[in-house]
Interface confidence: low
């Protein structure tokens, strides 16, 4: 008699490792005999495709070498012709020996960074990663950490964390190792030892010395006034990343050394400076009168404090009155990185419009003094401590620069802005208006001793200091 | 952000039908295998459903085969579960749950907050 | 019916270490049962720990480790923190067939 067909094994979930044979069986009984055709994920597979074999009247599939593709829904249907067709589906697991499908490269990284090594695997049962750096597993930290993925991230990379390693995928089935890679680890160049600056005499010998260390190890060039060292000479050593540059010159003019520390990372390069003045004793005395001209400000160190294009009185007692002058605010200016945050605006200011006073054009070009008051403002109100020190040490000689001296004024001997307004220059960094407080707060211990005249605030500078790193 | 939202809980009585729904973001919906998995009120997880990334079949726990069926809808980003013929058993927390890989099987690495479904008279 | 078995309750002082374990009623389990570790606190729901026996997921602390010693799955918190008390429950696959992924009664764990 004609019977619908009954499939008497449902297909089970089939577990299969790669390349090797999968079989669904869907056992039926009808009569007639069936139709029977197999599907995966839906799609019909052809009776033709060599990859399978189909046998025992459409009983048997079999997946000749299983690849890890071949994971999904298998259904068998069977038809007669006598009732509806019945159908039967069942899962393919592939199960797979860990595989490293996305090794992980040579890195290099500069220090600070983050670096990301990449193992990206594949299996089933999902394999485990783990790392191993030179020989021993790998810890994670609160900086290093193994992703999902596999990767392993290291946060804020340090020197010790250059190395060799290697990712590691384990499942139930197999470990899969990576080639060992390396993580090199970069930094950036750094001044270990600044040069010194020096007092000599005329024609004397001054070796000025830096030291500096990165990775790769950098190289040291030195800088005299802004250009390239034309005379005297540089020797250098290098011992465990460090390198030693020893510049040994012969004075015959005060100048501005400047040690530059390079190294290359990648298409970049990262820079360290420090600077040394030499100084002449004696050289720095200007003569009783006022000789010099007006001219733009052109220097570095007060760009921030002076007004953009600001016309300075350039004092010709010097052989070189641009470079003295800068050099005599550059070597003050250093001394200034230690005093308090309320002092070293107000001490700037000062010492950037005393040195490169502002300038009256004309028949014969005069220099205009800062006005008494604010003098005082800096010396009794935002620097009080500061210039107690300061005078304290010139009183026990231990300035033994004169340019020290040159750069501080004797607030006691400039004029009042109540005398002739037009006669003296007022520092606007250091005007305090109670309706547009833009500058510096009032100080509330005590009532300083001083009047600052309520002068509309000016705005039109920040007191920044260059970075000392720098990449170009 | 990856999310699962589960709605359509409620209170519903012995007998009586519910389908939960199960909105998903932040990840690659057809990607992955999806499960629901219930907490009764003050005891532990049970799993109840789960279906593969492409709907091709589908796995229930043997005391709901026959009266719940989960389906997917890859286009909405949506997971569901039709309840029939519910018992008082079945009141429970009804998480949705991403599982780690492609098909059904593998661990349940993210879930939806639940949502609470009473089968009472 | 084979039941996947935890200690009820288990407390441990903070700092501390303590090891969870994940037995059958009947058999032992292996890594062929690809334990899987989850924890619950009061009023959340569940957050994937540990799969596959011993692989950690994104985000979850390095305390947080498992294994199978002896015939059961283990989890183990090393140096307890006071935000680690709560329910952790581990599952099973039960033989080959996916269908069949059982949870574990769960361990409310205390850290005193």
């Known amino acids: 008699l004609p019977k619908a067909p009954v499939i008497t094994t449902p297909l089970e979930t089939v577990d299969a490792l790669v390349e090797e044979v999968a079989t669904f069986m869907c056992a039926v009984e009808s009569y007639p005999q069936p139709e029977i055709s197999w599907t995966r994920n839906k799609i019909l597979i052809k009776l033709f495709d060599t990859r399978y074999s189909i046998r025992e009247n459409g009983q048997l599939l079999t997946i000749l070498s299983v690849e890890d593709s071949d994971d999904g829904i298998y259904c068998c249907t069977a038809n007669n012709g006598v009732g509806g067709a019945v159908e039967s589906c069942g899962a393919l697991q592939v199960k797979m020996k860990p595989k490293i499908t996305r090794p992980p490269i040579n890195v290099k990284i500069i220090e600070g960074l983050k670096a990301v090594l990449p193992c990206t695997t594949m299996g089933n049962p999902k394999p485990s990663v783990s790392w191993i750096k030179g020989d021993s597993p790998l810890r994670e930290n609160s900086r290093t950490a193994v992703l999902e993925s596999g990767s392993l991230r290291i946060h804020n990379v340090q020197k010790e964390d250059a190395g060799q390693y290697r990712c590691v995928a384990k499942n139930s089935l197999g470990t899969a190792y990576s080639k060992v890679v390396k993580l090199e680890v970069e930094v950036f160049a750094r001044i270990l030892r600044a040069p010194e600056s020096h007092n000599v005499t005329f024609g004397s010998f001054v070796t000025l010395h830096c030291t500096a260390t990165g990775i790769p190890v950098p190289t040291i060039t030195w800088i005299e006034n802004g250009n390239a060292v034309s005379s005297g000479s540089i020797q250098e050593s290098v011992k465990d990343r460090v390198i030693d540059s020893r510049l040994q010159l012969f004075i015959t003019k005060p100048g501005l050394y400047t040690c530059i520390a390079t190294n290359k990372h990648g298409e970049k390069f990262s820079t360290a400076k420090a600077a040394a003045t030499v100084s002449i004793a004696e050289w720095s005395k200007p003569q009783k009168d006022n000789k010099g001209y007006c001219a733009q400000y052109r220097g570095e160190v007060c760009n921030a404090v002076l007004a953009k294009d600001a016309l300075v009185f350039l004092n010709t007692s010097y052989a070189d009155p641009e470079e003295a002058q800068e050099l005599l605010v550059h070597t003050a200016w250093n001394e200034l990185k230690v005093v308090s945050p309320l002092c070293r605006p107000a001490a700037e200011a000062l010492l950037c419009n005393h040195v490169f006073q502002e300038c009256s054009p004309g028949v014969v070009p005069t220099p205009i003094p800062i006005c008494r008051e604010y003098c005082l403002a800096v010396k009794e109100l935002f620097c009080a401590k500061e210039w107690l020190a300061m005078e304290e040490k010139t009183h026990r000689g231990l300035y033994r620069s004169e340019m020290h001296l040159l750069s501080v004024p004797e607030c006691s001997k400039l004029p009042s802005m109540h005398w002739d307004p037009t006669a003296c220059a007022r520092l606007p960094h250091l005007d305090y208006n109670k309706e547009n407080p833009k500058t510096f707060p009032p100080m509330t211990s005590s009532k300083p001793s001083v009047d600052i005249p309520n002068l509309p605030s000016s705005s039109s500078s920040s007191f920044s200091v260059s970075p000392t790193y720098s990449m170009t | 952000e990856l999310q699962l939202v589960e709605s359509g809980g409620g209170l519903v009585q012995p007998g009586g039908s519910l389908r939960l729904s199960c909105a998903a973001s932040?990840?690659?919906?057809?990607?992955?295998?999806m499960s629901w998995v219930r907490q009764a009120p003050g005891k532990g997880l049970e799993w109840v459903s789960a279906?593969?990334?492409?709907?091709?079949?589908?796995y229930y726990k043997e005391s709901v085969k026959g009266r719940f069926t989960i389906s997917r809808d890859n286009a909405k980003k949506t997971l569901y579960l039709q309840m029939n013929s519910l018992k008082s058993e079945d009141t429970a927390v009804y998480y949705c749950?991403?599982?780690?890989?492609?098909?059904?099987?593998?661990?349940?690495?993210?879930w939806g907050q639940g949502t609470l479904v009473t089968v009472s008279s | 019916q084979t039941v996947v078995t935890q200690e009820p309750s288990l407390s441990v002082s903070p700092g501390g270490t303590v090891t969870l374990t994940c037995g059958l009623s009947?058999?032992?389990?292996?890594?062929?049962?690809?334990p899987d570790w989850y924890q619950q606190t009061p009023g959340q729901a569940p957050r994937a720990l540990i799969y596959?026996?011993?692989s950690r997921h994104s985000g979850v602390p390095s305390r947080f480790s498992g294994s199978t010693s002896g015939n059961k799955a283990a989890l183990t918190i090393t140096g307890a923190q006071p935000e680690d008390e709560a329910d952790y429950y581990c599952?099973?696959?039960?033989?080959?067939?996916?269908?069949?992924?059982?949870f574990g009664g769960g361990t409310k764990l205390t850290v005193l």
């Open positions: 749950a991403k599982r780690s890989g492609r098909i059904a099987f593998g661990a349940l690495d993210a």
């Open positions: 279906i593969p990334w492409n709907g091709g079949s589908t």
């Open positions: 932040g990840f690659t919906f057809d990607d992955y295998g």
């Open positions: 009947s058999g032992s389990v292996t890594s062929s049962n690809y």
């Open positions: 596959s026996t011993n």
């Open positions: 599952a099973l696959y039960m033989g080959s067939d996916i269908r069949n992924y059982v």
